[in-house]
Amino acid sequence: TIDTKRNISAEEGGSVILQCHFSSDTAEVTQVDWKQQDQLLAIYSVDLGWHVASVFSDRVVPGPSLGLTFQSLTMNDTGEYFCTYHTYPGGIYKGRIFLKVQESSDDRNGLAQFQTAPLG
């Protein structure tokens, strides 16, 4: 089975870890695909290791484990993310995460434009 946090949130400009946990007594993971909606983020395979899709190569870092670290988040990154675990002999298992990217707390407080360096 796949276990994951169904809903997560993170701040704009920040980073988030996307993580699915697969558990089985018999099946072994052979490949894991990560997608943002329909768009490929990254793939891991036992044979080949990690490949991050070129579209996301400046913002997606493999790991920890079989998860992904998604950096420099924008509001447009809000949406559904899917992990697909290819296993042998168990078949294919899918997990879903909904990521909500929120305005940074500074923006919400109206301070983003007015921060200054300390005097001295």
Epitope: K35, D38, Q39, L40, S45, A53
Partner: antibody, heavy 118, light 107 residues
Framework: EVQLLESGGGLVQPGGSLRLSCAAS????????MHWVRQAPGKGLEWVAA????????GYADSVKGRFTISRDNSKNTLYLQMNSLRAEDTAVYYC???????????WGQGTLVTVSS | DIQMTQSPSSLSASVGDRVTITCRAS??????LNWYQQKPGKAPKLLIY???SLQSGVPSRFSGSGSGTDFTLTISSLQPEDFATYYC?????????FGGGTKVEIK
């Protein structure tokens, strides 16, 4: 540098047999699924067969099923296509191809021409 | 089998033109769509994988978009070396299938 070098093509009569080879170098052959794709003269690309990295799983186009057999020898870094009961419509350039993650073809060989004619 | 329909089958364009080629799948294939360029007498070359990811070493004037059933390959400013035939290919399920090709010719 990744290289895929096909050989074994040539002229064969209808009903005859041919064995194509693809020698791979420049990468860990045993980690990749490998495919054969063909192209008839002046036509488009047609997928022929595929084999997983460990040789445990293979698949074929309906047009060649039961006549062609894909195999590999990971110790020799070589992919094979045994073609039996050849027909005129099998005439084509045959390419071997590397397919990472079973997703896209990132490297192709230069191709070998198979001509089936009496 | 999943059918891949490419259009147009051929087009004439000039250096510097923006060129768009479309590919339609007979059923949803998510983003399991790749684009290749082939020049006469040569093997195909991967341009775009997973619908929108640019293969390493391919010029940035090439871009891909789409998901589900409708996909597009765009060449933002056609260069002399881009005159070739372009193929889409789905890897959602076997048998893998290719579009019929689009030949880009000099106007």
């Amino acid at each position: 540098e990744v290289q895929l070098l096909e050989s074994g093509g040539g002229l064969v009569q209808p009903g005859g047999s041919l064995r194509l080879s693809c020698a791979a170098s420049g990468f860990t052959f045993s980690s990749y699924s490998m495919h054969w794709v063909r192209q008839a003269p002046g036509k488009g690309l047609e997928w022929v067969a595929a084999i997983k990295s460990d040789a445990g799983t293979s698949g074929y186009a309906d047009s060649v099923k039961g006549r062609f057999t894909i195999s590999r020898d990971n110790s020799k870094n070589t992919l094979y296509l045994q073609m039996n009961s050849l027909r005129a419509e099998d005439t084509a350039v045959y390419y071997c191809a590397r397919v990472p993650y079973d997703y896209w073809i990132d490297y192709w060989g230069q191709g070998t021409l198979v001509t089936v004619s009496s | 089998d999943i059918q891949m329909t490419q259009s147009p089958s051929s087009l004439s364009a000039s250096v510097g033109d923006r060129v768009t080629i479309t590919c339609r799948a007979s059923q949803s294939i998510s983003s399991y769509l790749n684009w290749y360029q082939q020049k006469p007498g040569k093997a195909p070359k991967l341009l775009i994988y997973a619908a929108s990811s640019l293969q390493s070493g391919v010029p940035s004037r090439f871009s891909g978009s789409g998901s589900g059933t409708d996909f597009t390959l765009t060449i933002s400013s056609l260069q002399p070396e881009d005159f070739a035939t372009y193929y889409c290919q789905q890897s959602y399920s076997t048998p893998l299938t290719f579009g019929g090709g689009t030949k880009v010719e000099i106007k």
